[in-house]
């Protein structure tokens, strides 16, 4: 007979990412004997919850809980039965619920209560459902990216932990209702609200982060539509040949469009609006989303928000990736430089509805928004955050790293399950090569 080495036991964790437009479930796994290593936690499986985000169930809170059942049933199958009780389960809600909480706190509470009721029916170790702050969303996205890319520590050949020579990667997240920018900075923040101090594996990180509510892709599109209704009889960002009937109540019900809301309007009135394929007017419309008129600090990004100069390389994920990927793959346009990104946005905005449909067969109405989306991404990066050509060269557009989705979910779980120690493991403490 000979000894057969058993594979190391695996541990699991589940995070429900309750975004503004939809909810995604991520199941993570890691070897139990290596849980303090960096980059050791990876994605086991995922599931997209059918239907809208939980904030869309404001009028039917129980439906929010019910919507999660299909994915939770998948989790029962994906996580070995003997691991169910020891598997932490979290739900984090982001900007869609932040907006609902602003406009209707009672409905927000009811929705969270309903999802909590559903989640407690399952045999996992449920550890709460809550709304993340914009700062948490940004920082946990940054932690996820750098953890997956093993930027915090490395396990050396001599069996010691050491700090790698490479720096950390900045993180840019474009969600449905908000956008986040997070990066390591050397100088102290002039605005304390935008600085986070982290201690990870014995190393200290000073991180700048800011979340812009109402600057997520979907809310931007809605704000642009509201602006087009206000200033034009057409929509310059929509393709010529695309016409839609708009219920005014749908446009103005979001707290993000309150600035464009007429003092009196008939919410049940339906107006017709057509596209005009006008890249220059579209750019002007998008520019109107950013204010550079006042800055109470030495420097700002936009809307009077402090931001140090962007430094180092960045990963841009979620809708940043989807927008740029559409330009690259569906449209076949180069986007390696800021100039190319701008040219690509202009190219899409010049297309008629018929041209777009012919160029990207199969897709339907979603095509109408790519001009505005591309123009917004280009303006946000260049004018909003202040990326010049050199800095833009250090931005990678990616949705995954190490076969794991990049987003706040993994960083959130790593933090709450103490999978990233503040200090390096004592028995394997090595030389600090900083």
């Amino acid at each position: 007979t000979r000894d057969i080495r058993e594979p190391p036991a695996l541990k699991y964790g589940i995070v429900l990412d309750a975004g503004s437009s939809h909810t995604s479930m991520f199941i993570y796994k890691w070897p139990a004997d290596k849980e303090n290593d960096t980059g050791i936690v990876g994605q086991h499986s995922s599931c997209d919850v059918p239907g809208g985000g939980i904030s869309s169930y404001a009028d039917n809170p129980s439906g929010a809980g019910q919507s999660l059942v299909g994915c939770l049933e998948q989790a029962l199958r994906d996580v070995p039965k003997e691991r169910h009780a020891g598997t932490p389960l979290y739900l984090g809600a982001t900007a869609g619920m932040r907006l609902l909480n602003l406009t209707n706190p009672e409905a927000s509470t009811s929705v969270l209560t309903a999802v909590t009721h559903t989640l407690t029916q399952y045999p996992f170790d449920f550890r709460g459902a809550r709304i993340l702050s914009g700062q948490e969303e940004g920082v946990f996205g940054w932690v996820t990216a750098n953890y997956l890319l093993e930027n915090f520590i490395k396990y050396g050949w001599v069996g010691r932990w050491f700090r790698p020579r490479k720096g950390t990667l900045g993180a840019m997240d474009l969600g449905g209702a908000s956008t986040q920018i997070t990066f390591e900075t050397t100088s102290p923040a002039e605005d304390r609200a935008s600085e986070v101090q982290l201690r990870l594996y014995g190393q200290h990180y000073r991180v700048y982060t800011h979340s812009f509510l109402c600057y997520g892709r979907d809310q931007v599109l809605q704000r642009l539509l509201a602006s087009a209704l206000q200033t034009h009889s057409f929509h310059p960002c929509w393709p010529r040949g695309f016409s839609t009937h708009v219920l005014l109540g749908d446009v103005y019900q979001s707290p993000c469009t309150v600035a464009q809301r007429p003092q009196t309007f008939n919410s049940s009135a339906r107006v017709s609006l057509s596209g005009s394929s006008d890249p220059h007017l579209c750019r002007d419309l998008v520019s109107g989303l950013f204010s550079f008129s006042s800055c109470p600090f030495s420097r700002c990004s936009f809307n009077g928000v402090f931001q140090p100069p962007v430094a180092g390389n960045f990963i841009a994920f979620s809708a940043f990736f989807y927008t740029v990927n559409f330009l690259r793959t569906s449209m076949g346009l180069p986007v390696a430089t800021l100039q190319q990104l701008e040219a690509a946005a202009v190219n899409v905005c010049n297309q008629t509805w018929a041209q777009l449909q012919a160029r990207v067969p199969g897709q339907q109405a979603h095509l109408a928004d790519y001009c505005a989306g591309a123009m917004f991404v280009q303006q946000l990066l260049s004018r909003g955050y202040g990326f010049d050509e050199r800095a833009f060269g250090g931005v990678i557009f990616q949705k995954k790293a190490a076969d794991t989705a990049v987003g706040w979910a993994l960083g959130y779980m790593l933090n709450l399950t103490n999978l990233i120690p503040a200090d390096p493991p004592g028995l394997r403490k090595g030389t600090d090569f900083s």
């Epitope: 979907d218 219920l247 979001s254 109405a365």
Partner: antibody
Framework: QIQLQESGPGLVKPSQTLSLTCTVS?????????WNWIRQHPGKGLEWIGY???????NYNPSLKNRVTISRDTSKNQFSLKLSSVTAADTAVYYC??????????????????????WGQGTTVTVSS | ETVLTQSPATLSVSPGERATISCKAS??????????MNWYQQKPGQAPRLLIY???NLESGIPARFSGSGSGTDFTLTISSVEPEDAATYYC?????????FGGGTKLEIK
């Protein structure tokens, strides 16, 4: 109130071209909407043939694209369907319909839903020798 | 193209009873949390008329006894309390992908 009315021959010989016209009243076909042709084979479901937009752009069902032409006559506020090289399989009730993209909010996300909300009564076309 | 399969082909219901019609898509008709599914009613000798759009939104002027639900590939049209005038053929239609496609129809008969 928008109204649509189909007209054209009820009998077409195989290999010939089927020609139908839809007259729109109560709305200018250049003002908005997508002007569709849809057909229904006997005892079967509905099949979208294609449209001509208010802007004169065409969009056809790929399965029929090589045989279909949809055009318009703005002076008469009409749009027409031509289907070439017909066979018995093209025997159907042909409808014209006005469609548009309806903007609607779902989950804080504005979306565009293509609906066809004004229809003609339909005209039966038989392909037979 | 997206193929829509409706069931049952025929449904016989007494007035006041509930009627449920199913529509299954060969691929998801959802995009970013929204469902691109519409329902139409066609009475004998008449043109179809729009009942529901975006899976669950009732078209104006349609009685509240009609409702739609579902997402992804599975959708349902429900008539909570059938009335004699509801005798018709009901069609689902997707607009997520070009070309727009319709289901084969479900004929609702009133007993």
């Amino acid at each position: 109130q928008i109204q649509l009315q189909e007209s054209g021959p009820g009998l077409v010989k195989p290999s010939q071209t089927l020609s139908l016209t839809c007259t729109v009243s109560g709305y200018s076909i250049t003002s908005g909407y997508y002007w569709n042709w849809i057909r229904q084979h006997p005892g079967k479901g509905l099949e979208w043939i294609g449209y001509i937009s208010y802007d004169a752009d065409n969009n056809y069902n790929p399965s029929l694209k090589n045989r279909v032409t949809i055009s318009r006559d703005t002076s008469k506020n009409q749009f027409s369907l031509k289907l070439s090289s017909v066979t018995a399989a093209d025997t159907a009730v042909y409808y014209c319909a006005g469609g548009y993209y309806r903007y609607g909010l779902g989950s804080y996300r504005g979306s565009y839903y293509y609906v066809m909300d004004y229809w003609g009564q339909g005209t039966t076309v038989t392909v037979s020798s | 193209e997206t193929v829509l399969t409706q069931s049952p082909a025929t449904l016989s219901v007494s007035p006041g009873e509930r009627a449920t019609i199913s529509c299954k898509a060969s691929q998801s008709v959802d995009y970013d949390g929204n469902s691109y599914m519409n329902w139409y009613q066609q009475k004998p000798g008449q043109a179809p008329r729009l009942l529901i759009y975006a899976a669950s939104n009732l078209e104006s002027g349609i009685p509240a006894r009609f409702s739609g639900s579902g997402s992804g590939t599975d959708f349902t049209l429900t008539i909570s309390s059938v009335e004699p005038e509801d005798a018709a053929t009901y069609y689902c239609q997707q607009s997520n992908e070009d070309p727009p496609t319709f289901g084969g129809g479900t004929k609702l008969e009133i007993k």
